[in-house]
């Protein structure tokens, strides 16, 4: 058993049929010694008396808010949550496996630049009685500070018969060094509590591996005289790290016909313009990627040929 | 060339070669998403590689003030990785095919380090740890880890030379 926060405790249980459970001793936070009784949740049934209460925690029915009273007055509370371990593996019932980039990916994170700011998100089908808390650091043995905000519900989607909820959190490394080569990964830890179930999820990454630039901005076409060719130009996204002579991007320019089956013409360039042939009813799209490190491509910025 | 007197390197040549290094480092070890390197009792085997750190002057301001600190750091790293790529970790089994990008990568690391340091001038280099794996699969693990950290190292080096070529070239 360990303390998650003041008056909230997590009991770690091996979860299998007829498991013996864990013996837990609760102590009433009071100078009083006599006349103390204990109840669980809203029930008025007295579970025991005395300054300490010993319970055998085996299942969710044994978890909840234990309260010690004296003469109708509440003295203190202890909330017990359960953390299940099945076949040596901690349960992951609360969050959905996003399966990208690999199985057992519960947290996904992205950064728009090298400033040390990043966003993580996760999915669940649970709509109520759900809380999250997020901690992060650079490295684990001698951790350096990363400050995370509160997790918020950022999207709701309908998937078949189910509703899916996306939560996200923004974090910022306290003393980021954008030009340095990271040697210690960022660690992100999410505590999830649903009713009386506790779970924790972790992710470890380098900012360089989660970089995904915003799409190029101000995408414009300039027809070239007496030609089907156009000059496409664009700019670095505002959110990208500066100076651009140091934090350089590379670009992919694509000409795509109306039909998805039509052949796509692609050009790669380090410049912020390119000359392409504009077909009727086609669109021109541009996306960006770090020039020197193969992290994710941005989403496409597009304009119609016409 | 970065010579003892502190004169400028051939920024544009360094830029071109460092960008080539980036391409080679990624072709030698593309992102293999289904490989879980942590599964193999992942002791930190590549902790001793030289990293370009915050105080090494490789940021735009540091380069403007005095690029020599940064160039020395990059040179150290290039020599270190060149030695690693020429060691038993990469020459042993399972053997890399002759057309593997690792061969070109090895030669390009040497080429860039020579551009930075002409014959006759010696910056001190970092000792290469003796990592001789007893099992061939450990060699494979080390290769992947070394190439991953090399990708990060050459990315920073390429940014330095691109910025130098754009802003510090005479």
């Amino acid at each position: 058993i360990w303390e998650l926060k003041k008056d909230v405790y997590v009991v770690e249980l091996d979860w299998y049929p007829d498991a013996p459970g864990e013996m837990v001793v609760l102590t009433c936070d009071t100078p009083e010694e006599d006349g103390i009784t204990w109840t669980l949740d809203q029930s008025s049934e007295v579970l025991g008396s005395g300054k300490t209460l010993t319970i055998q925690v085996k299942e969710f029915g044994d978890a909840g808010q234990y309260t010690c009273h004296k003469g109708g007055e509440v003295l203190s509370h202890s909330l017990l949550l359960l953390h299940k371990k099945e076949d040596g593996i901690w349960s992951t019932d609360i969050l959905k496996d996003q399966k990208e980039p690999k199985n057992k990916t519960f947290l996904r994170c992205e950064a728009k630049n090298y400033s040390g700011r990043f966003t993580c998100w996760w999915l669940t089908t649970i709509s109520t009685d759900l809380t999250f808390s997020v901690k992060s650091s650079r490295g684990s043995s001698d951790p350096q500070g990363v400050t995370c905000g509160a997790a918020t519900l950022s999207a709701e989607r309908v998937r078949g018969d189910n509703k899916e909820y996306e939560y996200s959190v923004e974090c910022q490394e306290d003393s980021a060094c954008p030009a340095a080569e990271e040697s210690l990964p960022i660690e992100v830890m999410v505590d999830a509590v649903h009713k009386l179930k506790y779970e924790n999820y972790t992710s470890s990454f380098f900012i360089r591996d989660i970089i995904k630039p915003d799409p190029p901005k101000n995408l414009q076409l300039k027809p070239l005289k007496n030609s089907r060719q156009v000059e496409v130009s664009w700019e670095y996204p505002d959110t990208w790290s500066t100076p651009h002579s140091y934090f350089s991007l590379t670009f992919c320019v694509q000409v795509q016909g109306k039909s998805k089956r039509e052949k796509k013409d692609r050009v790669f360039t380090d410049k912020t313009s390119a000359t392409v042939i504009c077909r009727k009813n086609a669109s021109i799209s541009v996306r960006a990627q770090d020039r020197y490190y193969s992290s994710s491509w941005s989403e496409w910025a597009s304009v119609p040929c016409s | 060339r970065a010579v003892p007197g502190g004169s400028s390197p051939a920024w544009t040549q360094c830029q071109q070669l460092s960008q080539k290094l980036c391409t080679l480092a990624w072709s030698a070890h593309p992102l293999v998403g289904h490989m879980d390197l942590r599964e193999e009792g992942d002791e930190e085997t590549t902790n001793d590689v030289p990293h370009i750190q915050c105080g090494d002057g490789c940021d735009p301001q540091g380069l403007r003030d005095n690029s020599q600190f940064c160039l020395q750091r990059i040179h150290q790293g290039l020599i270190f990785y060149e030695k690693l790529l020429g060691s038993d970790i990469f020459t042993g089994e399972p053997s890399l095919l002759p057309d593997s990008p690792v061969g070109q990568l090895h030669a390009s690391l040497l080429g860039l380090s020579q551009l930075l340091q002409p014959e006759g001038h010696h910056w001190e280099t970092q000792q290469i740890p003796s990592l001789s794996p007893s099992q061939p699969w450990q060699r494979l693990l080390l290769r992947f880890k070394i190439l991953r950290s090399l990708q990060a190292f050459v990315a920073v080096a390429a940014r330095v030379f691109a910025h130098g070529a754009a802003t510090l070239s005479p």
Epitope: - | D88, S95, W137
Partner: antibody, heavy 126, light 111 residues
């Protein structure tokens, strides 16, 4: 075509040594390793060790506790396996096999004993 | 050393029927979760062994009635429709850790 031709059968006394040769032809000798595997009469296969002429690396089965020495002569494309302090339980057919052990982006860990010698019967008897 | 345990020791199957051979390693012989360092060899009487399955890949020239599966510690070689020429002893071999080790062999016969 690829061929591995082993030296002939040997009868040895306990405590003595035997040196079996394996001459390779039909491929670039230094691009592959040579593995030695033995098979006692009516028994299974036992890996003894392998040598890679290009890297100079040799891997041994510690079970043989320094009794086995595997070498290669690049000039004649011949591999050798010497087993010392022979005992009756060393009676077996000794095979050499070409070992391809490569790493590519597509196949990061490809290992094949793809061509085998005809085998050399070594009999240890007093 | 990694111990490779094959089962059954011998197997009699009718022509055209399926034959399944198992190989269990005393510790994982996959690398990075996905690369198999487990191989299958076929040995006919009086001949040296012949490679039939390399990691997760059927060797070229080997009929596609042979298939290999498994990961971690448990592996299987399946002959979907046994032919007369498949009568042999089959060995698994791990080359994750030196010393490389063979299984004890499974003799496949026609019932």
């Amino acid at each position: 075509q690829v061929q591995l031709v082993q030296s002939g059968a040997e009868v040895k006394k306990p405590g003595s040594s035997v040196k079996v040769s394996c001459k390779a032809s039909g491929y670039t000798f230094t691009s592959y390793g040579i593995t030695w595997v033995r098979q006692a009469p009516g028994q299974g296969l036992e890996w003894m060790g392998e040598n890679y002429p290009r890297s100079g690396n040799t891997y041994y089965n510690e079970k043989f506790k320094g009794r086995v020495t595997i070498t290669a002569d690049k000039s004649t494309s011949t591999a050798y396996m010497e087993l010392s302090s022979l005992r009756s339980e060393d009676t077996a057919v000794y095979y050499c096999a070409r070992a391809e052990f490569i790493s590519t982006v597509v196949a990061p860990y490809y290992y094949a004993l793809d061509y085998w010698g005809q085998g050399t019967l070594v009999t240890v008897s007093s | 050393d990694i111990v490779m345990t094959q089962s059954p020791d011998s197997l009699a199957v009718s022509l055209g029927e399926r034959a399944t051979i198992n190989c269990k390693a005393s510790k994982k012989v996959t690398i990075f979760g996905s690369i198999s360092a487990l191989h299958w060899y076929q040995q006919k009487p009086g001949q040296p062994p012949k490679l039939i399955y390399n990691g997760a890949k059927l060797e070229s020239g080997v009929p596609d009635r042979f298939s290999g599966s498994g990961s971690g510690t448990d592996f299987t070689l399946t002959i979907s429709s046994l032919q007369a020429e498949d009568v042999a002893v089959y060995y698994c071999l791990q080359n994750k850790e030196v010393p490389y080790t063979f299984g004890g062999g499974t003799k496949v016969e026609i019932k």
